[in-house]
């Protein structure tokens, strides 16, 4: 399955929208920095495409879930959020189309399941942090910065997969 070129463009648009969503000066939020433990090893180049597609799908699904909450809607600009949802939804569709075409529908490797679990735990840590920080503006900015970084890293994986073919 070849992810369409539009998927790559969509990823870039997603990052641009995340950048535009900023609401406050970040300089006041230094002390709110936090180690969320992004499972970078789960996005390493050692995976086959059949293994990476479901992990990337999980990553984008979790981002969608995170920014679809009531607390998120209160934190961000509604128009930008709607555009953001649209981009993520399109990327999920692209990845799901690959799964339907037969990529990764054979016997599920244990490694892939572990990777999906690691991504879920990562987002649980982010959700817990927001809760502990009472969904403060700075906490949301720290999370937005973290999602930009982790999404960018996972996007780079998609690009490396495409260039290997």
């Amino acid at each position: 399955c070849d992810l369409p070129q539009t998927h790559s463009l969509g990823s870039r648009r997603t990052l641009m929208l995340l950048a535009q969503m900023r609401r406050i000066s970040l300089f006041s939020c230094l002390k709110d920095r936090h180690d969320f433990g992004f499972p970078q090893e789960e996005f390493g180049n050692q995976f086959q495409k059949a293994e990476t597609i479901p992990v990337l799908h999980e990553m984008i699904q979790q981002i969608f879930n995170l920014f679809s909450t009531k607390d998120s809607s209160a934190a961000w600009d509604e128009t930008l959020l709607d555009k953001f949802y649209t981009e993520l939804y399109q990327q999920l569709n692209d990845l799901e189309a690959c799964v339907i075409q037969g990529v990764g529908v054979t016997e599920t490797p244990l490694m892939k399941e572990d990777s999906i679990l690691a991504v879920r735990k990562y987002f649980q840590r982010i959700t817990l942090y927001l809760k502990e920080k009472k969904y403060s503006p700075c906490a949301w900015e720290v999370v937005r910065a973290e999602i930009m970084r982790s999404f960018s890293l996972s996007t780079n994986l998609q690009e490396s997969l495409r260039s290997k073919e």
Epitope: A19, S28, L30, F36, A145, E146, M148
Partner: antibody, heavy 121, light 107 residues
Framework: EVQLVQSGAEVKKPGESLKISCKGS????????IGWVRQMPGKGLEWMGI????????AYSPSFQGQVTISADKSISTAYLQWSSLKASDTAMYYC??????????????WGQGTLVTVSS | DIQMTQSPSSLSASVGDRVTITCRAS??????LNWYQQKPGKAPKLLIY???SLQSGVPSRFSGSGSGTDFTLTISSLQPEDFATYYC?????????FGQGTKVEIK
């Protein structure tokens, strides 16, 4: 390879203006902030200020607020430090360094080689 | 502003010695503390970030500890290339501030 390359040494007279530069390469320039640090001859490090090149938001140390201006041109991955009217006390080595912003990553992990500014009549 | 106080301001030691430099913040900075090494005519080099994380490429003889207001940089066995000036820096809030430096000289 990540690099921050600063402009060359400058010799200026009191009252003159100056703009020194710091060009980033080998990484996404807008994903990191750029900070400026002063070191006067034989003295320690003093943080001057910082810029987020993605939107040019700046923060200054109270000691340097109004004395210098920090700017950036993201199209050429370059940050700047400028003076409108130099004083003899501005004689120092000036360093730029990159900062990961709100990400949990090493602060000021890469530094420029420094720009020596000498102000003398 | 958060004031950073380093001690000692200078020390003399021999190759192989265990060296400890302390840094105290005027208020709690959690673990937002960095350590840098600077040699004459060179830019500072990051050694330790977030109080205890060793920067990539830095020898394991360097270690950092502490949280809140009191921090320590330890060189377990001083090497000839370690003779330099060391600075702590708080990364908790702006304005960022450095300690005054500790010069490690050859005894």
């Amino acid at each position: 390879e990540v690099q921050l390359v600063q402009s060359g040494a400058e010799v200026k007279k009191p009252g003159e203006s100056l703009k020194i530069s710091c060009k980033g390469s080998g990484y996404s320039f807008t994903s990191y902030w750029i900070g400026w640090v002063r070191q006067m001859p034989g003295k320690g490090l003093e943080w001057m200020g910082i810029i987020d090149p993605s939107d040019s938001d700046t923060a200054y140390s109270p000691s340097f607020q109004g004395q210098v201006t920090i700017s950036a041109d993201k199209s050429i991955s370059t940050a700047y430090l400028q003076w409108s009217s130099l004083k003899a006390s501005d004689t120092a080595m000036y360093y730029c360094a990159r900062h990961p912003g709100l990400n949990w990553a090493p602060d000021f992990d890469y530094w420029g080689q420094g720009t020596l500014v000498t102000v003398s009549s | 502003d958060i004031q950073m106080t380093q001690s000692p301001s200078s020390l003399s030691a021999s190759v192989g010695d265990r060296v400890t430099i302390t840094c105290r913040a005027s208020q709690s900075i959690d673990e937002f503390l960095n350590w840098y090494q600077q040699k004459p005519g060179k830019a500072p080099k990051l050694l330790i970030y977030f109080a205890s994380s060793l920067q990539s490429g830095v020898p394991s003889r360097f270690s950092g500890s502490g949280s809140g207001t009191d921090f320590t940089l330890t060189i377990s066995s001083l090497q000839p290339e370690d003779f330099a000036t060391y600075y702590c820096q708080q990364a908790h809030s702006f304005p960022l501030t450095f300690g005054q430096g500790t010069k490690v000289e050859i005894k």
